[in-house]
């Protein structure tokens, strides 16, 4: 008799794929544009990335450090009108893209939460949550919560409003902290909170350290849903050398939880390569004309247009990973088991019941390595086969779809492999 199928977990929409942050509308659209109407025209691009949610803004009225000219219910006229916002929501809904609104109050100022009385601001946030929920947003993000006194209790109140409206609404909190204890204390009192932090930002370039960070985090958070990013707002290139971008994309898309990216992460957008551009929000490179300041500074392979035409580009990898992440049960909600594969390597299995299983092997080092996969570390339910099919490699040159002998697995410097194998009873 066939074994019984394992009961599927309840899946919220943010469990099914990546979130895409557009913190600066003007930088994202470029060419002096940068409003909600223009963003509506970019939704097809977001659809092509197969992201599930757009984390937008902040876009509310905020004069730097001035509570008397900050209004969480009013859209800054530079970004458009409430009608433009409603229209964006409708279009996004049609494309199955959820919209999460960033309500960090003093986003143009020194202290995101002002240095004054917290109660008043927090009470106003409650009214703003209600207002925007009724307007149709799918969730909220608040950043820099380390600057918010009594953050845990305020987050719990805001979570109550968000969830009280609908269980299908999401609250994301962001912190600059990379300290696990601080992160856990924020998560403790807030069951469904998605927290973005700098926890992984100092993972360095060793597989062992990354493995240790990831497993510590997963063990500490138990069975709660995680999010994976390198910071609450910044680009991957702020933390990583170019050669590790593909590796991290593969890792973020295949760890158990929601991957969260910033606009430009999919093309390796790097402010350092664009003189005069702000580190936190460089102009998005749609094509070679996106950065006219210095002629010739932008080559085709740095742009969306150029990378879209190249199947070996970072953007193409992002799209493939995003597609896999959103349709494979083992990646959607499968169990996670990390195991030893030798120094410099981080490897893990994702598996769900009798569905196709995935093996991820990541070489963080700058030398080629043979993987010594220690299957003995794995529980019986997650045993390794002798061979697995190569779904994709972060490096060009490997024949995809071909079976690889796991005992003889060799990885190039900075290479990541995603392999698949069937369930065997």
């Amino acid at each position: 008799r066939a074994p019984r199928c394992r009961e599927l977990p309840a899946q919220k929409w943010w469990h099914t794929g990546a979130l895409y942050r557009i913190g600066d509308l003007q930088a994202f659209q470029g060419h002096g544009a940068g409003n909600l109407a223009g963003l509506k025209g970019r939704l097809d691009y977001l659809s092509s990335l197969k992201v599930k949610g757009l984390v937008l803004g902040p876009i509310h009225k905020n004069q730097k450090d001035d509570v008397a000219q900050t209004d969480l219910l009013q859209i800054d006229p530079n970004f458009g009108s409430k009608e433009d916002f409603d229209s964006l929501l409708q279009s996004a809904k049609k494309k199955s893209i959820r919209v999460i609104l960033d309500l960090t109050p003093n986003y143009r100022g020194e202290n995101s939460w002002f240095s004054t009385q917290v109660d008043t601001v927090a009470t106003k946030v409650k009214d703003a949550l209600e207002f925007w929920l009724q307007a149709g947003v799918d969730g909220f993000q608040v950043r820099d919560i380390e600057n918010l006194k009594d953050a845990s209790s305020f987050l719990a109140e805001w979570q109550n409003i968000t969830k009280g409206f609908s269980e299908d609404r999401l609250l994301i909190a962001g912190t600059n902290s990379s300290d696990l204890q601080q992160i856990l204390s924020l998560l403790e009192s807030n069951k469904d909170l998605l927290l973005t932090s700098s926890y992984l930002s100092d993972s360095g370039s060793t597989g062992e350290h990354t493995k240790s960070l990831v497993t510590q985090y997963l063990n500490a958070t138990g069975n709660r849903w995680c999010s994976w990013s390198l910071s609450q707002a910044r680009l991957l290139t702020s933390f990583l050398p170019a050669q590790l971008l593909r590796l991290y994309q593969l890792m973020l898309f295949t760890l158990p939880g929601t991957p969260v990216f910033s606009y430009g992460d999919e093309i390796g957008l790097d402010a350092a390569a664009l003189p005069g551009q702000p580190m936190e929000a460089p102009v998005m490179l749609w094509d070679e004309s996106s950065f006219p300041d210095i002629p010739g500074a932008v080559s085709a392979n740095m742009t969306v247009k150029g990378q879209s035409e190249d199947p070996g580009s970072l953007l193409s990898l992002f799209r493939r990973l995003s597609d896999q992440r959103s349709k494979e049960r083992s990646l959607l909600h499968g169990d996670f088991h990390a195991f030893s594969a030798g120094p410099g390597l981080f490897s893990y299995i994702r598996h769900w019941d009798q569905n196709e299983r995935f093996l991820v092997v990541l070489n963080f080092g700058d030398v080629g390595l043979s993987a010594g996969l220690q299957a003995s570390d794995l529980p019986a339910s997650a045993s390794l086969p002798a061979k697995a099919d190569l779904l994709l490699s972060t490096q060009p040159g490997r024949e995809e779809g071909s079976p690889l002998e796991l005992e003889r697995l060799k990885l190039e410097p900075h290479e990541g492999l995603l392999l698949r194998f069937p369930y065997a009873a």
Partner: antibody, heavy 120, light 107 residues
Framework: DVQLVESGGGLVQPGGSRKLSCAAS????????MHWVRQAPEKGLEWVAY????????YYADTVKGRFTISRDNPKNTLFLQMTSLRSEDTAMYYC?????????????WGQGTTLTVSS | DIQMTQTTSSLSASLGDRVTISCRAS??????LNWYQQKPDGTVKLLIY???RLHSGVPSRFSGSGSGTDYSLTISNLEQEDIATYFC?????????FGGGTKLEIK
């Protein structure tokens, strides 16, 4: 022009009930939080209750908690204050006031008030 | 609850005078201080919010200042229509609380 007009005041016996109304016009009512503030004869102003635009967030002064209920009907642009177990100390002029949407909280527009007298 | 105190309950001044009304909070209210004018007929209007910001339509002879726990309202050139009672109010925490009021009269 923002306009707030209160009604429903009058003479009520102690222990009785009364419902005050406030008709709003000149602004998008559902966007704004609304307050009731009262003033006893020859006394200062006292905040009574607050309700957010969509009725999710409601707060009361300790002196009225459990006896008064604030509510609103957004399609009808009307704010209410249901008062029960009335006492002589509830005798006052009752004002409805609009809460600014700015983070610098204030009552930016007020009605002209309606008088409630609690007496036997 | 935060107590708001207006030590002067009534004040006489001549037309054209510069008048200052003060208000003290029982704790730091971080500039979340508003001033209201109540005319003899009972109508109430917001004059100044967040310590010093003039509400729309309010004449520029009204100004506000202060910080921490001490705040004041100044009328630079008293006019007949300014005869009223002035209340301060803190917006720092719930419950919102008012001062007892300062009644301004003409000498």
């Amino acid at each position: 022009d923002v306009q707030l007009v209160e009604s429903g005041g009058g003479l009520v016996q102690p222990g009785g009930s009364r419902k005050l109304s406030c008709a709003a016009s000149g602004f998008t009512f559902s966007t704004f939080g609304m307050h009731w503030v009262r003033q006893a004869p020859e006394k200062g102003l006292e905040w009574v209750a607050y309700i957010s635009g969509g009725s999710t967030n409601i707060y009361y002064a300790d002196t009225v908690k459990g006896r008064f209920t604030i509510s609103r009907d957004n399609p009808k642009n009307t704010l209410f204050l249901q008062m029960t177990s009335l006492r002589s100390e509830d005798t006052a002029m009752y004002y409805c006031a609009r809460e600014t949407t700015l983070l610098a909280t204030n009552f930016d527009y007020w009605g002209q008030g309606t008088t409630l007298t609690v007496s036997s | 609850d935060i107590q708001m105190t207006q030590t002067t309950s009534s004040l006489s001044a001549s037309l054209g005078d510069r008048v200052t009304i003060s208000c003290r909070a029982s704790q730091d209210i971080s500039n979340y201080l508003n001033w209201y004018q109540q005319k003899p007929d009972g109508t109430v209007k917001l004059l100044i919010y967040y310590t010093s910001r003039l509400h729309s339509g309010v004449p520029s002879r009204f100004s506000g200042s202060g910080s921490g726990t001490d705040y004041s309202l100044t009328i630079s050139n008293l006019e007949q229509e300014d005869i009223a009672t002035y209340f301060c109010q803190q917006g720092s925490t719930l419950p919102r609380t008012f001062g007892g009021g300062t009644k301004l009269e003409i000498k």
